[in-house]
Amino acid sequence: SSCGQVKCRKGEQCVHTASGPRCFCPSPRDCESGCASSPCQHGGSCHPQRQPPYYSCQCAPPFSGSRCELYTAPPSTPPATCLSQYCADKARDGVCDEACNSHACQWDGGDCSLTMENPWANCSSPLPCWDYINNQCDELCNTVECLFDNFECQGNSKTCKYDKYCADHFKDNHCDQGCNSEECGWDGLDCAADQPENLAEGTLVIVVLMPPEQLLQDARSFLRALGTLLHTNLRIKRDSQGELMVYPYYGEKSAAMKKQRMTRRSLPGEQEQEVAGSKVFLEIDNRQCVQDSDHCFKNTDAAAALLASHAIQGTLSYPLVSVVSESLTPERTQ
């Protein structure tokens, strides 16, 4: 119904009031629910109302506003500290202990986060974004520095329709249009061979507990799995001779693990020769990402941090040990 310039929606009635004509919903059941568009952000609950905008939001602290879009900083709370002596004793031993897997405990001293003690170091959001990996969009964390809110603001739940087929045909130099989508990893760039590469700055250096021959054999699956987490494409970097940069890794000799030496009895020097895994150098190619998304990594720093964040959540499907982002062309060092 309408009266004058006011057009009312389905199920609404027009009521003449002192301040002019207004739309009114006599029975919210019969009207389009204002809640249909999920207007309440940050976990706020939506309640249908009889008058425009036909909803009201009940916000969860620390949010407020008509759509729970406003963040209200709580009175300054002291930063959480890692109180547990247990966690102090267990930090940096190479084993992730969930009781210590918190921001305050530096993710068990990096043991749960691929040795990166603060993946959110560059995140300046007023929200503690590490606590907002919650399957809903938190715009205040939806920045590259805050790791794109774990991609929760752009349909993170989309899955590859023909996943098995697309995995088998990923990066096989044959374009499968059914796999040429973000959720299917853009068919490993098979459909973009004629497009110029768009490399992110830097290199991801990953230690994975798979010997080089096994990793190279499984390279397509490995690159697809990591690319899926980063919502872009990865490739193994080549050295100046054109060789793939995948090297044997002989185990951690850093101070972080001198704390707990390998306990098997071995001849001097023998332990160093045992291949524990691989050190692989990866590049990010955004040629498809930039066409479909504005959430692409311009450099490898935040990409490394996002992988660390996945390690914290326990959602990595490969036995990664560490990840670092190198800005300059690396020398081959072990």
């Epitope: 084993v95 749960c112 798979m210 990595l316």
Partner: antibody
Framework: EVQLVESGGGLVQPGGSLRLSCAAS????????MSWVRQAPGKGLEWVSY????????YYADSVKGRFTISADTSKNTAYLQMNSLRAEDTAVYYC???????????????WGQGTLVTVSS | DIQMTQSPSSLSASVGDRVTITCRAS??????LAWYQQKPGKAPKLLIY???SRASGVPSRFSGSGSGTDFTLTISSLQPEDFATYYC?????????FGQGTKVEIK
Amino acid sequence: EVQLVESGGGLVQPGGSLRLSCAASGYSFTSYGMSWVRQAPGKGLEWVSYIYPYSGATYYADSVKGRFTISADTSKNTAYLQMNSLRAEDTAVYYCARHSGYYRISSAMDVWGQGTLVTVSS
Amino acid sequence: DIQMTQSPSSLSASVGDRVTITCRASQSISSYLAWYQQKPGKAPKLLIYGASSRASGVPSRFSGSGSGTDFTLTISSLQPEDFATYYCQQYYSSPLTFGQGTKVEIK
């Protein structure tokens, strides 16, 4: 097929020592944590110790700390439990069990060996 | 240390019955809980991890629920091969601890 096979159990006198072995096959031994779990006759399960073969990090139950030592030989894909100063209450079937979550002690044990019986008696 | 308390310690049931076993942790363990089945003379077998995820090859009649301190294992329709002892276990922090077990016997 992922498999764990324990050996080394037997009869030992109180105060004596024994070394149990757990041979792993069918997976990347270095990548996954390993625990020893024991079960006294007619009783429930008790976790004993954990090792992450890659880093060599170890964890122990208070009841065995200082007496038992867990270790791993990554070249042999074998975990060990060296048991010293054995007591009657250590009598149990000892199982080795693989953790499902790579470097996480905070993961379930998804593969178990068949167990080896240790009897401590004079 | 985190204590795990299972109830009941034993129960008698018939084939086709719905069986529920509960497990309570002395402090919050989020969803870091597993359920194991053990038959006499055999090693334990993982049934449920993460409080509610079924392990590979486990029949759909087994389900787990709960979070924090209270957890449940449900067998929707008891089969002859399900008569065994069931253990819950927390893996939130070391020392890893088990419940005392629930023996499911034939009525």
